[in-house]
Interface confidence: medium
């Protein structure tokens, strides 16, 4: 028996359902009574779901997995993983045994988009050219860790005096706080871009300082 899976990682958004595709080619006369199907975590061999002795043995993985029972006899051994969590990320092995056996691994990559950044300025009043200011760009609830880029109003990258911290919350999602310290010119726009490297999603935030008072551009 030959097992086939997608070579590309399956990308799934947090809290959505993902399908890990796996198929085999049944011989003529194949019946489900002959099938021994096991999904397991590749690294630890932790059991995830199984179909043995002619029936679905159910989820062994937080009761969030299911097979496609009507399609099994056609050789579709795919696994549905519901309400995907960050901790589900990793490699899953599909193991099929009929008379002989074969297995193949498929990777699950979990992702969550970052929120539109919020911008704060410190100090935020009585600003004068030549003052040192701290601009903080905050974006929330993304996964995996973000890439953060700062630019000035002319699109020139700002790389000096930038400190970025990323903290995972209890769900494993990251909150990003990036701090830029700059000396104010007469006026200027400072923008931050938070990029999710898996989703290729960019979230933008900017602040414009025009003497007095400072303004934030309207929401996009």
């Amino acid at each position: 028996v030959e097992v086939q899976v997608s070579e590309d990682p399956v990308v799934a958004l947090v809290d959505t359902d993902a399908t890990l595709r796996c198929s085999f080619s049944p011989e003529p006369g194949f019946s489900l009574a002959q099938l021994n199907l096991i999904w397991q975590l590749t690294d630890t061999k932790q059991l995830v779901h199984s179909f043995t002795e002619g029936r679905d043995q159910g989820s062994a993985y937080s009761n969030r997995t299911a097979l496609f029972p009507d399609l099994l006899v056609q050789g579709n051994a795919s696994l549905r993983l519901q309400r995907v969590r960050v901790t589900d990320e990793g490699s899953y092995t599909c193991f099929v045994s009929i008379q002989d056996f074969d297995s193949a691994a498929v990777s699950l990559q979990v992702a969550a988009p970052y929120s539109k950044p919020s911008m704060t300025l410190e100090p935020n009043k009585d600003l004068r050219p030549g003052n040192m200011v701290t601009i903080t760009c905050s974006s929330y609830q993304g996964y995996p860790e973000a890439e953060v880029f700062w630019k000035d109003g002319q699109g020139v990258p700002l790389t000096g005096n930038v400190t970025t911290s990323q903290m995972a919350n209890e769900r494993g999602l990251f909150d990003v706080h990036s701090v830029l310290r700059v000396v104010l010119g007469a006026n200027g726009t400072y923008s931050c871009l938070v990029r999710n490297p898996v989703l290729q999603q960019d979230a933008h935030g900017s602040v414009t300082i025009t003497g007095q008072p400072l303004t934030f551009p309207p929401e996009a």
């Epitope: 096991i38 397991q40 061999k45 059991l47 199984s50 043995q57 159910g58 062994a60 045994s97 297995s103």
Partner: antibody
Framework: QVQLQQPGAELVKPGASVKLSCKAS????????MHWVKQRPGQGLEWIGL????????NYNEMFKNKATLTVDRSSSTAYVQLSSLTSEDSAVYFC??????????WGQGTTLTVSS | DVVMTQTPLSLPVSLGDQASISCRSS???????????LRWYLQKPGQSPKLLIY???NRFSGVPDRFSGSGSGTDFTLKITRVEAEDLGVYFC?????????FGGGTKLEIK
């Protein structure tokens, strides 16, 4: 007929590790899951986990995840449980039991593990 | 984890009497595949447990018909009609619907 052979007893010092065996005969080893169960003297039964001999797939009771490691040697039709960092709490009879994923019909006679210095 | 509560703890009987043991689970034992994985075992001193009843009411091969199981959901009963000397020992109920699989605390069937 189905037989699961286990050594009668093991004596081990605290802090050490031990690997208990269960040799299967009378059936196709890879067609049954193998379960392990702990029974302390005069107490109830605790399920440690299971392993599938063909795929090596395992499912542990969280309570034993850092204590027990299940393995198989298909060539000798033998299942093993390795117990680490032993304390007196690990002194017990350890049974292997063969069956499906959701049941276990055939039990070994059990190995009495004594942890003592 | 699913807690399995057995009553009574000890059951003194006379040979030839009927015995009844109750087992209650802390949540339903109906599996997603529709079956109920509740089993009864008998363990005699110095021996491993022997399977009597599987899936609530099915007698395992070689088990005499004086043993019967019944129940559904969370409440289950093992009945032994006409208790014989060889029936004495500790009876355990067990569930394998939910991981981790769990056992009742046991009921000791002894001569009155």
């Amino acid at each position: 007929q189905v037989q699961l052979q286990q050594p009668g007893a093991e004596l081990v010092k605290p802090g050490a590790s031990v690997k208990l065996s269960c040799k299967a005969s009378g059936y196709t080893f890879s067609s049954y899951w193998m379960h392990w169960v702990k029974q302390r003297p005069g107490q109830g039964l605790e399920w440690i986990g299971l392993i599938h001999p063909d795929s090596g797939s395992t499912n542990y009771n969280e309570m034993f995840k850092n204590k027990a490691t299940l393995t198989v040697d298909r060539s000798s039709s033998t299942a093993y449980v390795q117990l680490s960092s032993l304390t007196s709490e690990d002194s017990a009879v350890y049974f292997c039991a063969g069956g499906g994923r959701l049941y276990f019909d055939y039990w070994g006679q059990g190995t009495t593990l004594t942890v003592s210095s | 984890d699913v807690v399995m509560t057995q009553t009574p703890l000890s059951l003194p009987v006379s040979l030839g009497d009927q015995a009844s043991i109750s087992c209650r689970s802390s949540q339903s034992l109906v599996h997603s595949n529709g079956d109920t994985y509740l089993r009864w075992y008998l363990q005699k001193p110095g021996q491993s447990p022997k399977l009597l009843i599987y899936k609530v009411s099915n007698r395992f091969s070689g088990v005499p018909d004086r043993f019967s199981g019944s129940g559904s959901g969370t409440d289950f009963t093992l009945k032994i009609t006409r208790v014989e000397a060889e029936d004495l020992g500790v009876y355990f109920c067990s569930q394998s619907t939910h991981v981790p699989y769990t056992f009742g605390g046991g009921t000791k069937l002894e001569i009155k």
